[in-house]
């Protein structure tokens, strides 16, 4: 028969008491060996009953050098089946075997879940020599059992290439349930339900879960593991754990957070990086995100302007980085600039608004009547032209640019001259003679240079030529006009 | 389906003692706890406690203590409700209801009326 | 305890009419559960949780609130919803039903 030895059930129905064939204890095996050296009685590991017939592994000696007779089969006594204690305690077990004392190097190994037990495991075999057989006692001891020492411990043991293997040793370690899955943090939409998942393990079986909601029960009664909780919506953010529950006691989950998605916090700190005639630099920080991530971003520009509409300019953009060059400006002009962000919910409200403004623009106009002519005396080339009509924004003028090429036998020279902004007229040097002078004129001011005048171009001739006419800026439409003298 | 079904009408002299039946049926009788909620004439839903029918432990509310007890009888999955002593202003319609998450009664007995009088 | 406050007690509409009950509780609630009685019956689940509607009930009713808060709305009233509604708090111990609001035909 099997040996068994067990607690009296407990009559709480919830959680089943030990399997039969099965030892429950928080205390070191009663059918262990004390650590002590000497003669232990075998009788402490094999029931004093004739053991029922063995199934499992057995040597079968041959006949002895007498040949008179046959020696019985070789098998592991039984033992106790099943162990449960729980965590932290510390259990000793053991089997044993009478071996005939025909055999020599006898060794036992310890296996757990069909692997071997090497190394630092607390392993001891003792052997008592009688005149025709050994007995063999190996006993396997844990110190604080824990859960990874669950398992199915067999010996095993070697005689002429022969394999003997005793009845398994279930050990069962039992304590607090174990969560393998807890409730996650979450962002949630408003009123829209969601779920939340708890499950734990024991042993002991069964685990059952109790969910909690800002410190309230949510289920008035235990809901086996895995358990799954639908949340009917929520409305503020909430804070949600699980409890666990078994024979031994309670486990109580990380408490997570679960926040309701709302629109985003205004962006702060909106500041100017660079301005220019038609351009800003914009950069902000982003508010609050709103348990959502930013999908983009809003600049709004207004024109500060009493005579201005009141327009709303909107450039939308990516989210990150947060900046924005804002373009399509009018040069020295002022704006109020604001940003607002969006996630998933909606729109931020808008940021504080802030002025920024435009620098000087450059001419938007070249100057006019652009007229050249060579004055053969002084060998140089007298130019005219009339001030453009720039607008306020453009700025004050504060000069002209004049572009010079001289073009002569495939070779061409590109010069430049800068001119005070009361000119209205200059003179060049002839840089080459019996070549080509086109002049082109553009007007100057802090925000630029503006675009420059149609081409006029004039024949500079060899030496001893009379200058006659002039060139000048051709009307719209016409060819440019060389004039030779 | 769920169902509960609630003992008969029951009319007592005062002092006397009086046993309220709730027979449940159409789901695992363990897996939910039972609520007992009092109306009296006239008046609105008054709740007295409720039995969990997982450990047996009962649960009532201020005022329902003492004279009132909440008990079950799994195999048959039934909760009980007595009330002993019986006073006059104990006259009302009592009333079982089967209790989900968040206390939600999704089920409720059809009532059993109590009318106590000399 | 957490006492709930149903207001108005007595709502008179006629067919056709939009109700809105209203229930407020004596400190934060999460949850607030509404039920139908009819005479000589038993309570009929109505909203659970806030704002669900419980299995069979018409998509005229409706459910709202939170923290201190909570409404029931009838967007059309039927004859059949003339009865007496009662909300019910679930957030602490004990389980608290406020005192109803009986919708009656004007």
């Known amino acids: 028969a099997i040996t068994e030895a067990r607690e009296e059930a407990k009559p709480y129905p919830l959680f089943p008491g030990p399997l039969p064939g099965s030892l429950q204890t928080d205390h070191t095996s009663l059918l262990s060996l004390p650590h002590t050296s000497g003669y232990q009685p075998a009788l402490m590991f094999s029931p004093t009953q004739p053991g029922r017939p063995y199934t499992g592994n057995v040597a079968i000696p041959r006949v002895t050098s007498a040949g008179s007779k046959l020696l019985p089969p070789l098998a592991f006594k039984h033992t106790v089946g099943h162990i449960i204690l729980s965590e932290h305690k510390d259990v000793k077990f053991n089997c044993s075997i009478s071996v005939p004392n025909i055999y020599q190097d006898t060794t036992i190994s310890w296996w757990k879940d069909g692997k071997e037990l090497l190394g630092a495991h607390h392993a001891i075999t003792q052997f008592y020599p009688d005149d025709e057989v050994t007995a063999i006692i190996a006993s396997f001891s844990i110190t604080s059992v824990q859960r990874s020492d669950n398992g199915s411990y067999i010996c095993k043991m070697k005689i002429n290439n022969e394999e003997i293997v005793s009845d398994p040793i279930y050990i069962e370690v039992q304590g607090l349930p174990h969560f393998t899955k807890q409730p996650e943090s979450m962002n949630v939409t408003r009123n829209t339900a969601f779920n939340l998942t708890c499950q734990a393990v024991g042993p002991p079986e069964p685990v059952n879960i109790f969910w909690v909601q800002n410190s309230s029960r949510v289920n008035e009664q235990p809901e086996k593991s895995p358990s799954v909780l639908t949340v009917p919506g929520l409305t503020e953010m909430a804070v949600f754990s699980c409890e666990a529950h078994n024979d031994k006691g309670l486990t109580v989950s990380k408490g997570v957070q679960i926040n309701i998605k709302a629109i985003p916090s205004p962006p702060t700190e909106v500041s100017i990086h660079n301005s220019t005639a038609h351009s800003i630099l914009i950069s902000w920080v982003p508010g609050f995100d709103g348990y959502s991530p930013f999908r983009n971003c809003s600049v709004q520009v207004k024109e500060v302007d009493p005579l201005s509409n009141g327009s709303v300019m909107i450039f939308n953009t990516s989210a990150s980085p947060h900046m924005y060059q804002i373009k399509q400006l009018q040069a020295l002009a002022n704006y109020s600039i604001g940003v607002s962000c969006m996630n998933e919910i909606g729109w931020s409200a808008v940021s504080p608004w802030i002025l920024a403004s435009t620098t000087e623009g450059a001419p938007s106009v070249a100057p006019l009547n652009v007229t050249v002519f060579l004055n053969e005396s002084r060998d140089n080339v007298d130019i005219r032209w009339m001030k453009p009509l720039t607008k306020r924004q453009a700025g004050e003028l504060v000069g002209y640019r004049i572009s010079h090429v001289w073009q002569s036998a495939g070779i061409s020279k590109e010069l430049l001259e800068e001119v005070g902004q009361n000119n209205s007229r200059a003179q060049i040097s002839v840089q080459v003679h019996n070549a080509t002078c086109t002049v082109r004129i553009a007007a100057v001011t802090k925000g630029g240079v503006g675009p420059f005048s149609d081409p006029v171009k004039i024949f500079i001739p060899a030496h001893g030529w009379v200058d006659h006419a002039p060139s000048s800026t051709p009307a719209p439409g016409n060819a440019d006009p060389v004039l030779i003298i | 389906q769920v169902q509960l079904v609630q003992s008969g009408s029951e009319l007592k002299k005062p002092g006397a003692s009086v046993k309220v039946s709730c027979k449940a049926s159409?789901?695992?009788?363990?897996?939910?706890?039972v609520h007992w909620v009092r109306q009296a004439p006239g008046q609105g839903l008054e709740w007295m406690g409720w039995?969990?029918?997982?450990?047996?432990?009962?649960t009532y509310a201020q005022g329902f203590t003492g004279r009132f007890v909440f008990s079950l009888d799994t195999s048959v999955s039934t909760a009980y409700l007595q009330i002993s002593s019986l006073k006059a202003e104990d006259t009302a319609v009592y009333y079982c209801?089967?209790?989900?998450?968040?206390?939600?009664?999704?089920?409720w007995g059809q009532g059993t009326l109590v009318t106590v009088s000399s | 305890e957490i006492v709930l406050t149903q207001s108005p007690a007595t709502l008179s509409l006629s067919p056709g009419e939009r109700a809105t009950l209203s229930c407020r509780a004596s400190?934060?609630?999460?949850?607030m559960h509404w039920y139908q009685q009819k005479p000589g019956q038993a309570p009929r689940p109505l909203i659970y949780?806030?704002?669900n509607l419980a299995s069979g009930i018409p998509a005229r009713f409706s459910g709202s609130g939170s923290g201190t808060s909570y409404t029931l709305t009838i967007s059309s009233l039927e004859p059949e919803d003339f009865a007496v509604y009662y909300c019910?708090?679930?957030?602490?111990?004990?389980?608290?039903f406020g005192g109803g609001t009986k919708v009656e035909i004007k």
């Open positions: 400190s934060s609630v999460s949850y």
């Open positions: 209801a089967r209790g989900n998450r968040y206390a939600y009664m999704d089920y």
């Open positions: 019910q708090q679930w957030s602490s111990n004990p389980r608290t």
């Open positions: 039995g969990n029918t997982y450990t047996g432990e009962p």
């Open positions: 949780a806030t704002s």
């Open positions: 159409g789901y695992t009788f363990t897996n939910y706890g």
